[in-house]
């Protein structure tokens, strides 16, 4: 399978909410012993390999934000910790995987990475990630709502084996 990032850049005004999205593409094993571990984290540009560095999102680590579910299931983070930080990650039946960030501030600007790991019998079999940038703006140049910029076709199917 691959991970697609429909949008490579999100430009949002301060105070707005945004939902960053990744999408699982290709054949997904739905065997009873196969599950998917999905999470989000921040990273930085200019690395040898994008998304290799893992930084927290609003002080929450990738472990705090993870989802773990069967290939045919939907899931979301319901625990208070994420919601207290204005965050919620979710995954639907169609392979869409997202993180919603509420009440954006300038500090939220940066590179965000989604990670999907195929797990069989509690062991990782395959892992892919996708990257996108969030720019939070303030002042007269800021848009009134979030503006999203589609990835190039090459970027959107960002299959990066970690």
């Amino acid at each position: 399978f691959k991970v697609a990032t429909p949008y490579s850049l999100y430009v949002c005004p301060e105070g707005q909410n945004v939902t960053l999205t990744c999408r699982l593409l290709g054949p997904v094993d739905k065997g009873h012993d196969v599950t998917f571990y999905k999470t989000w984290y921040r990273s930085s540009r200019g690395e040898v390999q994008t998304c290799s560095e893992r930084r927290p999102i609003r002080n929450l680590t990738f472990q705090d934000l993870h989802l773990h579910h069967g290939g045919h299931q939907a899931a979301n983070t319901s625990h208070d910790l994420a919601q207290r930080h204005g965050l919620e990650s979710a995954s639907d039946h169609h392979g869409n995987f997202s993180i919603t960030m509420r009440n954006l501030t300038l500090l939220d600007s940066g590179l965000y990475c989604c990670l999907v790991v195929e797990i069989r019998h509690h062991h990782s079999e395959h892992r892919v990630h996708g990257a996108m940038e969030l720019q939070v703006q303030t002042g007269k140049d800021a848009p009134s709502n979030c503006v999203v910029y589609p990835s190039s076709s090459q970027d959107s199917e960002n299959i990066t084996a970690a």
Epitope: T35, T39, H68, H69, A75, V117, H122, H123, S124, R127
Partner: antibody, heavy 122, light 112 residues
């Protein structure tokens, strides 16, 4: 600090069932699998299976598949292991253990409960 | 099922001396993802087991550096560079590469 506290000792008759609990505290319950390992008197360790508290997924040792059921209650951060059709050979100390994971991938059983002695005797 | 065989089963050691425990598996425990899920646990008298080494050679936090693990494929070794009195107990190797996950039969380390 991480703690796994198990229920007290049980005495059961052959053919009966036993349900042992393991209450977790000091960490995010749904982020770590819980394993069950047993140890017969004077014997070695035997892995019985594991449960993922976030989704209820289980992996059982085939030897116990038809007799063991592992469940969890996320509201109380407790995992249960029920073993049915007990026989004398099931007399053992039953341990729960948490496994440390990274990206959903198993690493090792890093914290263990104190053990629960189950005695099967007529 | 993969059988893990430890030797020796009993290991009397003088404090300050080194000790070595061997663990062999009946087939390779290298997982298809490239990892080798081989661990070592110590069960001190009257206590629950405790983790020493994971993934062949990684020391768990708080484990003294006198403990080291090595090996590959089917042959693995736990070494204690200088045995101390508190190291007494039963040492178990454990493979988690192939279901069902299995323990070795244990090696009892005692002080001479």
């Amino acid at each position: 600090q991480v703690q796994l506290v198990q229920s007290g000792a049980e005495v059961k008759k052959p053919g009966a069932s036993v349900k042992v609990s393991c209450k977790a505290s000091g960490y995010t319950f749904t982020s770590y699998w819980i394993h069950w390992v047993r140890q017969a008197p004077g014997q070695g360790l035997e892995w019985m299976g594991e449960i993922n508290p976030s989704n209820g997924l289980t992996n059982y040792n085939e030897k116990f598949r038809n007799r063991v059921t592992m469940t969890r209650d996320t509201s109380t951060s407790t995992v249960y292991m029920e073993l049915s059709s007990l026989r004398s050979e099931d007399t053992a100390v039953y341990y729960c253990a948490r496994s440390y994971d990274y990206d959903g991938d198993y690493y090792a059983m890093d914290y263990w409960g104190q053990g629960t002695l189950v005695t099967v005797s007529s | 099922d993969i059988v893990m065989t430890q030797s020796p089963l009993s290991l009397p050691v003088t404090p300050g001396e080194p000790a070595s425990i061997s663990c062999r598996s009946t087939q390779s425990i290298v997982h298809s993802n490239g990892n080798t899920y081989l661990e070592w646990y110590l069960q001190k008298p009257g206590q629950s087991p405790q983790l020493l080494i994971y993934k062949v050679s990684n020391r768990f936090s708080g484990v003294p550096d006198r403990f080291s693990g090595s090996g590959s494929g089917t042959d693995f070794t736990l070494k204690i560079s200088r045995v101390e009195a508190e190291d007494v107990g039963v040492y178990y190797c454990f493979q988690a590469s192939h279901v069902p996950w299995t323990f070795g039969q244990g090696t009892k380390l005692e002080i001479k």
